[in-house]
């Protein structure tokens, strides 16, 4: 080994990664909200729609105060990976009716991937345990009908909206602890 020498700073540090994750999450939340509103305009929802393969909501307002950094980041990454796969599936399986939303769904998928990359980088830099994201619990087969894919889109966007909403709050809270 040679004599001690300093290393130049890399592009970001964990706190900057967390700031970046907050910005990306907020931006993704706004996109999801807008896309969900477009969906409601084009295909009015008759009540709430569920999809068994979607993750259950990780947090409620009451549990925010007890959040720990590892748990939040691990759960958020696993849940977002599930939503990423669901959006992928929706784009592949969507009938002609949803094709009009393809550009928006494509942009949503790309932003989700970017946020997932940022969360993983943050977890690596903090050396937090990184559980391998599971495949969706229920295999995602083709929707039974055109209306089936519309109902699935409502469920996916609604669930993603709620997940991102708690994610923003959780990440902002974690900023104070890092």
């Amino acid at each position: 080994p040679g004599p001690p020498a300093g290393s130049p700073r890399v592009s970001s540090d964990p706190r900057a990664d967390l700031d970046s994750a907050v910005l990306l999450t907020r931006s993704l939340l706004a996109d999801t909200r807008q896309l969900a509103a477009q969906m409601r305009d084009k295909f009015p929802a008759d009540g709430d729609h569920n999809l068994d393969s979607l993750p259950t909501l990780a947090m409620s307002a009451g549990t925010l105060g007890s959040l720990q950094l590892p748990g939040v980041l691990t759960r958020l990454r696993v849940d977002l990976m599930s939503y990423f796969r669901h959006v992928q599936w929706l784009r592949r399986a969507a009938g002609p009716s949803l094709k009009t939303l393809e550009p928006e769904l494509g942009a949503l998928q790309a932003r989700l991937e970017r946020l997932l990359r940022r969360l993983q980088l943050l977890m690596s830099r903090l050396a937090l345990p990184q559980a391998a994201p599971d495949q969706p619990a229920v295999p995602l087969g083709p929707p039974a009908s055109a209306w089936g894919s519309i109902r699935a889109a409502h469920a996916i966007l609604g669930g993603l909206h709620l997940t991102l909403d708690w994610a923003v709050r959780g990440l902002l809270l974690l900023k104070t602890r890092l």
Epitope: D13, R15, P70, Q120, S124, L128, A132, L178
Partner: antibody, heavy 114, light 111 residues
Framework: EVQLLESGGGLVQPGGSLRLSCAAS????????MHWVRQAPGKGLEWVAV????????YYADSVKGRFTISRDNSKNTLYLQMNSLRAEDTAVYYC???????WGQGTLVTVSS | QSVLTQPPSASGTPGQRVTISCSGS?????????VHWYQQLPGTAPKLLIY???ERPSGVPDRFSGSKSGTSASLAISGLRSEDEADYYC???????????FGGGTKLTVL
């Protein structure tokens, strides 16, 4: 400028112990997970151990589990590696590294030989 | 034996483009874990070259680029220069080890 400065290496007999230290400066040490990575002479890189930013998580390579202990003191910006029951195959340059790892020290040589 | 597989050597002439591959498994690269690349010049410590599959730290020339697909990744170096002669290592988190794993390294020779 980021600096990681390892110390504590040297010649030790098989079965002996050594404690390596790594002094960090130029970045927020307490915000980074820290690793020890080693490189045997003429060989590739082998990850040894990692400790999370706050010290709550520690993981070890199978080859050192039960013999090596990683720890950190965030108030002193220092990382440690306590190495016990040393074997000839532990001979290597030991690097302290931060983050991904994003930053690496220059390494300290540990030689285990009788 | 390394968990990630790299070719032991690669070579090219100045100005050429060379690619170094890195093959993993379902517990590391294939599990959506990011790949990082390091350059180790003779007699020096490794240096981060590419992180998160394709991002460059500040100061790394854009001649270096990374990509990832499935269970493998690759590092491309275009406009090869004599100072690129070094050992290159890929790395990724491995869920079965709860830590990062490295490739065996590729010695790049500029002819």
């Amino acid at each position: 400028e980021v600096q990681l400065l390892e110390s504590g290496g040297g010649l030790v007999q098989p079965g002996g112990s050594l404690r390596l230290s790594c002094a960090a400066s130029g970045f927020t040490f307490s915000s980074y997970g820290m690793h020890w990575v080693r490189q045997a002479p003429g060989k590739g890189l082998e990850w040894v151990a990692v400790i999370s930013y706050d010290g709550s998580y520690k993981y070890y390579a199978d080859s050192v589990k039960g013999r090596f202990t990683i720890s950190r003191d965030n108030s002193k910006n220092t990382l440690y590696l306590q190495m016990n029951s040393l074997r000839a195959e532990d001979t290597a340059v030991y690097y302290c590294a931060a983050g991904v790892p994003d930053y690496w020290g220059q390494g300290t040589l540990v030689t285990v030989s009788s | 034996q390394s968990v990630l597989t790299q070719p032991p050597s690669a070579s090219g002439t100045p100005g050429q483009r060379v690619t170094i591959s890195c093959s993993g498994s379902s517990s590391n690269i294939g599990s959506d874990y990011d790949v990082h690349w390091y350059q180790q010049l003779p007699g020096t410590a490794p240096k981060l070259l590419i992180y998160s599959n394709n991002e460059r730290p500040s100061g790394v020339p854009d001649r270096f680029s990374g990509s990832k697909s499935g269970t493998s990744a690759s590092l491309a170096i275009s406009g090869l220069r004599s100072e690129d002669e070094a050992d290159y290592y890929c790395s990724a988190w491995d869920s079965s080890l709860s830590g990062p794993v490295f490739g065996g390294g590729t010695k790049l020779t500029v002819l």
